[in-house]
Structures are given as C-alpha cells and as structure tokens.
C-alpha cells in the first residue's frame, strides 16, 4: 500500500513543449536613413528594415517606427550590432578646434519603452574610442543579453551618430530578439 | 556582390511581344523587389512596374494590360514581357533592385542596383 | 501621378564651374527624392536619397538640398567626369516618377 502513494507521480500531466518555430522572434537589419533632429542629450534612434534581405518578424512580433514590439512576456535574448566608420583625419580636428560635432567615441544603446513607466530604460549599452584606430576605420560594437520583458514592451536601438553608421551591407549592422 | 545581368538587345517587327530577363546574383528574388525602367530616345528614364519580393507585382498604369512580370526562383531569374509594341516602345530597358530609405519616420524607394541595359528596337 | 518638373533641360559649364539643377514635384514628397547621374551607354548612377543624403561612395562635391516640392542638386566644382544627363525620382508612391532629365554638356 505503501508505494500507492507514489502511483500518482507517474501520472502527471506535463504541459506540451512549445515548438521554437512558434515563439515570438525578429531579425532587422540596417537600412539607409538621413540624420534627423533630436534632443542635445538624447540618443537618435536608427530605424531598420524589417521584411527584405535578411530580415525578417514572426509569430506575432512586429516591427513599427523604430521600435520591435514584444508580443508576450517571457525571457527574450536581445541582441544588436552597429558597425561605425569614419576617418581619424576627423580626430585630429576635434582636438585642435574642440569640434563638438565630431566624436571621439561611438556609443549603441539598446533601449526599452513601457508604456507605463514615464523613463526609457537602458538594457545594454557599448561605447569605443575611435581616434586611436587607423586612418579610415571601422568599428564594430555587438550587444546581447537575456531579459525579462512584458507584452507591450518596446525595444530599440539608439546610437551617438547616425551619420557614422555604415550601412553597406546587412551583415554589419542589425537587431533582432527572440523568446526563449 | 549584387549583380543584374540581362538578355541581349532585341530586333520585333510593331505588333509583336518582347520578353527580356534579367538574371540577378548576391541576393534572391524572394527576398528583394525588382523593378523596371525603360530609356527611351529623348525620353529620360520611365518607371515601368516591380516584382516584389513576395510574387506580387504593381505595374504603371501606362503599360497596364501590355507588360507582364514574372520571375523563376529556382534561376533567380526575373522576366519582363511587353506586348503590342509599337515603335515609341523602342528604348533601353533595365532592371533594377530598389531600395528602401527612411526620412524620419516615413520610407521610400530608389533604386542603388541596377542591369546593364537590353536594347529593344522595335522596327518594321 | 505625381509629376516632377526638371530644370534646365541643359546647361553648359566648365571643369570647376558650380552647377545647380532643379527638381519641383507637382505635390509634397516629404524628402522622398534621389538623383541619379546617366552616361550614355551606361546603366544610371545613384547619388544622392532623401533629397540630401550622399549615397556610399559618391564624391563630396555632389549635395542635394529641399523639401516639400522643391529640390536642388549642387555639384560644387565640376569634374570631366561629371559631364552627364541628371535624373530626379521620387521614392514616395507609384509609378515612382522620373524628372525628364538635365544634360550638363561641356561649354
């Protein structure tokens, strides 16, 4: 009788496992854009492509003005790569003349809006020096890290300098999420 | 790299069709949009109709019911027919694989790749 | 349709002149707009998107400026090379219309 009471355990019933090709997951990549104007102590936030090339949203994650959508709460990887380029001749001309509009560093930020809290909040964030490296060169800074995030999240991506983003070919630079 | 080979130029007597192709390499056609433009003499460039990358197409209002495109994905191969030509129908055409850009938060197209050119004389 | 006017149909100019080409859409196209540069015999060239944006590669001495209807392209100090027909498009809807074009020959 005794090992009756164990019988019940061989019964349990276990949720199905959820096929991966069902989650929530997104891939953007780098698409041409012109600097617009933000705000002097804010981040412009690049927008992406969504549906050519390598690109791609499924199973109910979207991508609208900037922003990827999270579709259900649960553990998400976030990830983003952003590839600079520029010409160290500008260094030079920053040190001399104290240009503000030329940087000595490049940052990336992966940024998360929620609709009911009033601040962006900062999940990841890169930042190099650019004025040591060669003549015409070339960096780039890959975030990614896991998180918890609700339905209704946003995500994006903010950079120092659009301008210096290369955008030459969608293996450079790009953003994508997916629930694990 | 992204290339766009075409057909060679092409000799049809008015009333006849023309069907050129345009054989792309460094992407698929499933997954980027394929337009066509046309140069004719005098003319500058004219924007004839896409094959977007899900099969669908849009074409100009002016060739509608005289071009068609098409395109086999197993050759990466996109098609443009032109029927009924008539001599104002010669011209250069070209493929080209269009971009999109944002300014602010609206996109647009152009048009950064394109083929080299395909001749249609069209002559009796 | 939107309409895009071109002007002049042609210019002549010397290597180092200073050119300026006009493009006017018949509506707003809200900076939707490229140039494109076509020699004869050769597939066009982009230039310039978003009425001022320098796609990769092209020298610095081509500049576009405008909105609304009205767009220019510069290029700041002519080049042999530069001898060519320049094309607008808008990029806003089909038919994604071409401007009919300003040859820039050599004076």
């Known amino acids: 009788l005794k090992g009756q009471e164990f019988a019940p355990s061989h019964q349990q019933v276990y949720a199905p496992l959820r096929a991966d090709g069902d989650k929530p997951r997104a891939h953007l990549t780098v698409v041409r854009q012109t600097p617009t104007q933000h705000f002097k102590n804010q981040f412009p936030a690049l927008h992406w492509e969504h549906e050519l090339g390598l690109a791609f949203t499924k199973n109910r994650m979207n991508y609208t003005n900037k922003f990827l959508l999270i579709p259900e709460s649960g553990d998400y990887f976030i990830y983003s790569q952003v590839t600079f380029r520029g010409m160290t001749s500008e260094c030079s001309e920053i040190r001399q003349a104290g240009r503000p509009n030329k940087p000595d560093s490049i940052t990336v930020v992966i940024t998360k809006v929620t609709d009911s809290y009033p601040e962006p909040t900062q999940l990841l964030m890169g930042t190099k020096s650019v004025c040591e490296v060669g003549s015409n060169w070339f960096q780039p800074i890959y975030l990614g890290a896991m998180f918890s995030l609700q339905e209704g999240d946003k995500l994006m991506v903010n950079v120092s300098d659009i301008s210096l983003v290369d955008y030459t070919k969608e293996d450079k630079t790009f953003f994508g999420a997916f629930l694990l | 790299q992204v290339q766009l080979v075409q057909s060679g130029a092409e000799v049809k007597k008015p009333g006849a069709s023309v069907k050129v192709s345009c054989k792309v390499s460094g992407f698929s056609v499933t997954r980027y949009n394929v337009h066509w433009v046309r140069e004719a003499p005098g003319q500058g460039l004219e924007w004839m109709g896409v094959?977007?990358?899900?099969?669908?197409?849009d074409y100009n209002s002016k060739f509608q019911g005289r071009v068609t495109m098409t395109r086999d994905t197993s050759t990466n191969t996109v098609y443009m027919e032109l029927s009924s030509l008539r001599s104002e129908d010669t011209a250069v055409y070209y493929c080209?694989?269009?971009?999109?850009?944002?300014?602010?938060?609206?996109?647009?197209?152009?048009?950064?790749?394109w083929g080299q050119g395909t001749l249609v004389t069209v002559s009796s | 349709d939107i309409q895009m006017t071109q002007s002049p149909s042609s210019v002549s100019a010397s290597v180092g002149d200073r050119v300026t080409i006009t493009c006017r859409a018949s509506?707003?196209?809200?900076?939707?707009l490229a140039w494109y540069q076509k020699k004869p015999g050769k597939s066009p060239k982009l230039l310039i998107y978003g009425a001022s944006s320098l796609q990769d590669g092209v020298p610095s001495r081509f500049s576009g400026s405008g909105s609304g209807t009205d767009y220019t392209l510069t290029i700041s100090s002519l080049q042999p090379e530069d001898f060519a027909t320049y094309f607008c498009q808008e990029g806003l809807k089909s038919p994604y219309t071409f401007g009919q074009g300003t040859k820039l020959e050599i004076k």
């Open positions: 080209a694989r269009a971009g999109r850009y944002y300014v602010d938060s609206n996109y647009y197209w152009d048009f950064p790749y």
């Open positions: 509506e707003d196209i809200y900076s939707g």
């Open positions: 094959m977007w990358s899900g099969a669908n197409t």
